[in-house]
C-alpha cells in the first residue's frame, strides 16, 4: 500500500551551477494523493529559512508528480545561496532538503566556464 503522505523530492546536498543574467527555474517535485498541498519556497539565511514573498512561482503537472517552480527572471548574483521548499499538509509542515544555487557573475568571470568545470568545482564559484 503506497503512502499518502506528501513527499518533496529534492536531493540532499544537491546544487545547480547557473549564470547571472540567465533565466532559471528551480523545481520542487511534489508527490501527493488527493489534494495538492500549499507549497512555498524560502531562502536560507544562516539557520533561518526566510519565506520568499511576491516571487513568480508556478505549478507544472506531470504523470505521477507535480512541480512547484520558483522562477528567476533573470538570475542575479544575490540569488546565490540555499533554498528549501515546504508543503503545508493536514496542518503539518513538510520541509524538503535544501538545494544550493551557485551563481557565476559573468561580468566578473574572464570567460564563461564550462558546466563540467563548475559542476566539479563549486567552491570556485561566486559566493
Amino acid at each position: 500500500k503506497e503512502s499518502c503522505d506528501v513527499q518533496l523530492y529534492i536531493k540532499r546536498q544537491s546544487y545547480h551551477s547557473i549564470f547571472a543574467g540567465d533565466p532559471f527555474k528551480l523545481e520542487c517535485p511534489v508527490k501527493y494523493c488527493a489534494h495538492r498541498p500549499q507549497v512555498t519556497w524560502c531562502k536560507l539565511n544562516g539557520t533561518t529559512c526566510v519565506k520568499l514573498e511576491g516571487r513568480h512561482t508556478s505549478w507544472k503537472q506531470e504523470k505521477n508528480l507535480s512541480f512547484f517552480i520558483l522562477h528567476f527572471e533573470p538570475v542575479l548574483p544575490s540569488d546565490n545561496g540555499s533554498y528549501r521548499c515546504s508543503a503545508n499538509f493536514l496542518s503539518a509542515i513538510i520541509e524538503s532538503h535544501s538545494t544550493t544555487l551557485y551563481v557565476t557573475d559573468v561580468k566578473s568571470a574572464s570567460e564563461r566556464p564550462s558546466k563540467d568545470e563548475m559542476a566539479s568545482r563549486p567552491w570556485l564559484l561566486y559566493s
Epitope: Q7, I10, R12, S17
Partner: antibody, heavy 119, light 112 residues
C-alpha cells in the same frame, strides 16, 4: 532489488587511465546519487567522489587532484569512473555504490573490481 | 576534512558475548537539517561492504536487531548485543555530513 555491476580492465599501465563502468538495475539512477570508493589491498576505504545522475553534477575528494572524472548515462542507467595518470599506489579494489538521494533509504555497493597498475 | 577514529583496532570476543565499537569524529556530524549522517558498514573477507546502520541508529532492511547504533555530535557506538558466528568481519564507520566523505580505519571483530 537494487543491484550494481562494475566492469573494466583489471590491469592498467603506469601513467595510463583507469576506466570503470557501473551498471545499475532495480532503480532509476536519476533518483539516486552514485559514488565510487576504493580499497587498496589489505587497507581501508577511500571515497573518490559522487555524481547526481539527474544533472551530471559531481563532487570529488580533493586528494585526487583533478585526476578523477565521474560521469553518468541516464539512458543506460550507468555511471563511469576515469582516473588518469595512475601509479602503483592506485592499485585497489574499486567499488561503485548507489544511494537514495532523497531519504537515504537504501545504500547498495557493487561487488568491486580489482585494478592493478603495473607495466 | 573530517577524521573518524575507530577503537579498538581489533576486538576479540566469543560468540554470544557483547561487542562495542567506538567511532570518534574530529568535528560534529550534526548537519544543518538537524540530522546526523553517520553510517556503519560491515565487510566480510572478499566481499563488498554492506551498510548496517544509517543516521546513527536506523537499521537497514534485513539487518538483525542485535545490531544497534547510538551517539551524537562527535561520539558514536556500534553495539552487537550477542555476537553470532557470521558477525566476525571488519566494521567501518563513515560520515555523510561533509565533503569529502570519510571513513574510519576499520575495526576487526575476531573470534576469541
Amino acid at each position: 532489488q537494487v543491484q550494481l555491476q562494475e566492469s573494466g580492465p583489471g590491469l592498467v599501465k603506469p601513467s595510463g587511465t583507469l576506466s570503470l563502468t557501473c551498471a545499475a538495475s532495480g532503480v532509476n539512477i536519476k533518483d539516486t546519487y552514485m559514488y565510487w570508493v576504493r580499497q587498496p589491498p589489505g587497507k581501508g576505504l577511500e571515497w573518490i567522489g559522487r555524481i547526481d545522475p539527474a544533472n551530471g553534477y559531481t563532487r570529488y575528494n580533493p586528494s585526487f587532484k583533478s585526476r578523477a572524472t565521474i560521469s553518468a548515462d541516464k539512458s543506460k542507467n550507468q555511471a563511469s569512473l576515469k582516473l588518469s595518470s595512475v601509479t602503483a599506489a592506485d592499485t585497489a579494489v574499486y567499488y561503485c555504490a548507489v544511494y537514495d538521494g532523497y531519504y537515504e533509504s537504501f545504500d547498495v555497493w557493487g561487488q568491486g573490481t580489482l585494478v592493478t597498475v603495473s607495466s | 576534512e573530517i577524521v573518524l577514529t575507530q577503537s579498538p583496532g581489533t576486538l576479540s570476543v566469543s560468540p554470544g558475548e557483547r561487542a562495542t565499537i567506538s567511532c570518534r569524529s574530529s568535528q560534529s556530524l550534526l548537519d544543518s537539517d538537524g540530522k546526523t549522517y553517520l553510517n556503519w558498514l560491515q565487510q566480510k573477507p572478499g566481499q563488498a561492504p554492506r551498510r548496517l546502520i544509517y543516521l546513527v541508529s536506523k537499521r537497514d532492511t534485513g539487518v538483525p536487531d542485535r545490531f544497534s547504533g547510538s551517539g551524537s555530535g562527535t561520539d558514536f557506538t556500534l553495539t552487537i548485543s550477542r555476537v553470532e558466528p557470521e558477525d566476525f568481519a571488519v566494521y567501518y564507520c563513515w560520515q555523510g555530513t561533509l565533503f569529502p566523505r570519510t571513513f574510519g580505519q576499520g575495526t576487526k571483530l575476531e573470534i576469541k
